[in-house]
């Protein structure tokens, strides 16, 4: 019996087609992805093959103005239109709190939404009961397939699930659910979830009875043969893991942002064992037509976005200096504003010992592309922020050793004075440079804001200590020459859309007046 699994993950609000790098589509003839194009390909495959499941491994939420405006209603609407069969909860599905998940998505989705390792407690337990499930048995042709969901247990550090959801260890939570499916005579089981490729592989290895793992969170690109675009494969598709009980378990992920549609063909024997598996992600490039009916629906929903872009988010009573002349040479108040917003967006008081789990922000000055003038009645709009942060990036959470941070700050000024983009703006950090010293030895003082303290204060950076830092995904990926971050980071979790972070902060503050306050000094 053959099953075709079509899968997406980490779509992050890319409802419209995007450029090849998943930013805003500029030249339509070169654009990719989007739900209208995805629908065309899904329908083609449904037409051609008998037993097809369309699955999503989480993180539909967060990433573009679509989510900012529609807050998840767009996800439910278009996933319903594409007739998804199941979705796993990702960490970003909790970005607007549990209510922001329940109302727009859980109550509106016409497909099951899954996670076996999230347990509700207190008053939420009855409110959310039945709205998401640990597993679902789906009829496919003449057979049944069990789908069991999982979500990163780090979600409380990455999003806003509140205090009434407990995120258990994935493997511990999955095993009893898979065992239950077995007792129900379901012998073909897919683990669908959002914990990253390393955990996906562990689940394949450790959870008895899981036949296939469809994952997300780490934006992993797997491919067999010559890859069709810029993404470099982390391994073959599917990635085969030998389980502890000796089975060959295919593990798949389909990069991110709706650029690819994962296509996995599985052959099962009559006892539900995987005999063979093959496939590849399908690049959704512009040679695949956008479905006109879905496209028309997208255009209808778009109208509200255009209106939103020009509405006031808040006011500034000072000039927001985002000029290259400032932000690539010295501390600039636009850099301070953005870093303060980044930290504010990551306030998660999850432990009595820590006032917060992260206190530091770094931001390449070259990523700040425009100032905002306060003389326009102080008004700040989404459109203004899009000029400051035009690249559609995310502000991510990483873990780095102190020694890596020191290298990053040396790199920040290694060729100072040439208006290059690697000069770092900061938050929760005090740095002093001596430019008379030779490159690689110019950081004379580097103090960082403590987290394990009741009264935050600045302490010298410790080389061997592991620190959490918020930074742009561009830096996490080694951009602007920050190879040491890419090479030495110990953990990387993708965060919220950059503009969304700053706009939320401005809306919350209502009136802002960021200053230049001595975060960066030259001796």
């Amino acid at each position: 019996w053959e099953l075709t699994i079509l899968h997406t993950n980490d779509v992050h609000s890319r409802l419209e087609q995007t450029s090849e790098d998943s930013s805003k589509c500029v030249n339509a003839s070169r654009c990719m992805g989007g739900v209208a194009r995805l629908f065309t390909k899904v329908q083609q495959i449904r037409r051609a093959e008998p037993n097809v499941l369309l699955l999503d491994a989480g993180d539909q939420y967060q990433g573009t103005i679509w989510f900012t405006v529609y807050k998840g209603a767009e996800v439910a609407h278009f996933m319903n239109a594409l007739r998804y069969d199941a979705m796993a909860l990702g960490n970003h599905e909790f970005d607007n709190g549990v209510e922001g998940l329940i109302e727009p998505l859980l109550k509106e989705a016409k497909f099951p939404i899954l996670s076996a390792n999230i347990k509700a407690k207190g008053p939420l337990a009855s409110q959310i009961s039945g709205l998401y499930l640990p597993y679902k048995v789906l009829p496919v042709g003449d057979e049944v397939v069990g789908i069991v969901g999982y979500t990163s247990k780090e979600t409380p550090f990455l999003s806003n699930p509140g205090t009434n959801l407990v995120f258990e260890d994935e493997i511990t939570a999955l095993q009893p659910e898979v065992d239950k499916l077995k007792t129900l005579n379901v012998n073909k089981i897919i683990a669908l979830g959002h914990s990253g490729f390393e955990m996906d592989k562990l689940i394949a290895q450790k959870v008895r009875g899981v036949d296939v793992v469809v994952g997300g969170h780490s934006n992993t690109f797997l491919y067999t043969g010559n890859p069709p675009s810029k993404e470099v494969p982390a391994g073959k598709y599917p990635f085969i893991v030998t389980s502890d009980d000796g089975r060959k378990v295919p593990v798949v992920q389909a990069y991110a942002f709706g650029k690819y549609l994962g296509y996995l063909k599985i052959e099962f024997d009559e006892r539900g064992n995987v005999i063979s598996s093959h496939g590849n992600p399908i690049l959704l490039n512009s040679s695949i037509p956008e479905d006109p009916s879905i496209k028309a629906d997208i255009n209808k929903w778009r109208i509200k976005l255009d209106n939103y872009s020009t509405q006031e988010l808040g006011k500034t009573i000072v000039y927001l200096d985002g000029s290259s002349q400032s932000c690539r040479f010295r501390e600039c108040n636009m850099g301070n504003l953005i870093c303060d917003a980044m930290i504010n967006n990551n306030l998660r008081h999850t432990d009595e010992m820590f006032w917060n789990h992260v206190s530091m922000c770094i931001l390449n000055g070259g990523g700040i592309r425009s100032p905002i003038d306060e003389r326009n009645n102080g008004t700040i709009t989404w459109e203004n922020l899009a000029a400051v942060l035009p690249f559609g990036g995310t502000f991510d959470l990483v873990q780095l050793k102190g020694s890596t941070l020191k290298k990053a700050f040396e790199h920040s000024v290694h060729r100072y004075g040439q208006s290059t983009g690697e000069f770092l703006q900061v938050g929760g950090i005090h740095v002093v440079y001596d430019l008379s010293r030779k490159p690689g030895d110019r950081v004379v003082k580097l103090d960082v804001l403590c987290t394990k303290c009741r009264v935050p204060s600045y302490d010298p950076l410790k080389m061997d200590e592991v620190y959490k830092v918020i930074l742009p995904n561009f830096l996490a990926n080694g951009g602007d020459g920050f190879q040491m971050i890419k090479d030495e980071l110990l953990r990387h979790d993708s965060g919220d859309q950059d503009i969304n972070v700053v706009s939320t902060y401005i809306s919350k503050m209502k009136v802002i007046y960021p200053a230049v306050e001595g975060r960066i000094k030259f001796s």
Partner: antibody, heavy 121, light 107 residues
Framework: QVQLVQSGAEVKKPGASVKVSCKAS????????LSWVRQATGQGLEWMGE????????YYNEKFKGRVTMTRNTSISTAYMELSSLRSEDTAVYYC??????????????WGAGTTVTVSS | DIVMTQSPDSLAVSLGERATINCKAS??????VAWYQQKPGQPPKLLIY???YRYSGVPDRFSGSGSGTDFTLTISSLQAEDVAVYYC?????????FGGGTKLEIK
């Protein structure tokens, strides 16, 4: 290399049936769609329907519904098109053409050489 | 059914000159349009798929453009071997339909 080899020419009487074969080689037969297209002498191209060998799913042009049957034998990588209740206007060259539904080339990338079917009393 | 209206029915162009063939769909077909070349006694050959993508091995003098309802095949510099009948086809909805063809000759 990819090849679609069709059966030889047929002469049929009105009311009879004809079955044309199309043997595929050089690719995985079950991973592509196969369409049948006909062309009357000096006329344009007319799509009759398609079969997906992997599933056996078929989709026919409404114009031929009830008269056309498309089948396949995956063990010998061959597709068949049977047209019944033949009339003189069915005289045409019948082509099979491959369609890569998993790829992105929206069109028929390989064609058979064609089978001439003549319907005459 | 979606009707594909091709124009002109026939076209005579001097060697080295540009030839342009148009195709109009009766409804929005996005970019799901292919162009074929057919020479006497031969099956059609795929030139352009998805409105503007040149099929592998097709000379770069052939190009396609358009989306929605209006499509164009252009031969930038006509060669003797380009004499043939050219067909457009929509691949958006079944039944997949072809244009009536354009016969291209040398002036």
């Amino acid at each position: 290399q990819v090849q679609l080899v069709q059966s030889g020419a047929e002469v049929k009487k009105p009311g009879a049936s004809v079955k044309v074969s199309c043997k595929a080689s050089g690719y995985t037969f079950t991973s592509y769609g196969l369409s049948w297209v006909r062309q009357a002498t000096g006329q344009g191209l007319e799509w009759m329907g398609e079969i997906y060998p992997g599933s056996g799913n078929t989709y026919y042009n409404e114009k031929f519904k009830g008269r056309v049957t498309m089948t396949r034998n995956t063990s010998i990588s061959t597709a068949y098109m049977e047209l019944s209740s033949l009339r003189s206007e069915d005289t045409a060259v019948y082509y099979c053409a491959r369609y890569d539904y998993l790829g992105s080339s929206y069109g028929f990338d390989y064609w058979g050489a064609g089978t001439t079917v003549t319907v005459s009393s | 059914d979606i009707v594909m209206t091709q124009s002109p029915d026939s076209l005579a162009v001097s060697l080295g000159e540009r030839a342009t063939i148009n195709c109009k769909a009766s409804q929005d077909v996005s970019t799901a349009v292919a162009w074929y070349q057919q020479k006497p006694g031969q099956p059609p050959k795929l030139l352009i798929y998805s409105a503007s993508y040149r099929y592998s091995g097709v000379p770069d003098r052939f190009s396609g453009s358009g989306s929605g309802t209006d499509f164009t095949l252009t031969i930038s510099s006509l060669q003797a071997e380009d004499v043939a009948v050219y067909y457009c086809q929509q691949h958006y909805n079944t039944p997949y339909t072809f244009g009536g063809g354009t016969k291209l000759e040398i002036k």
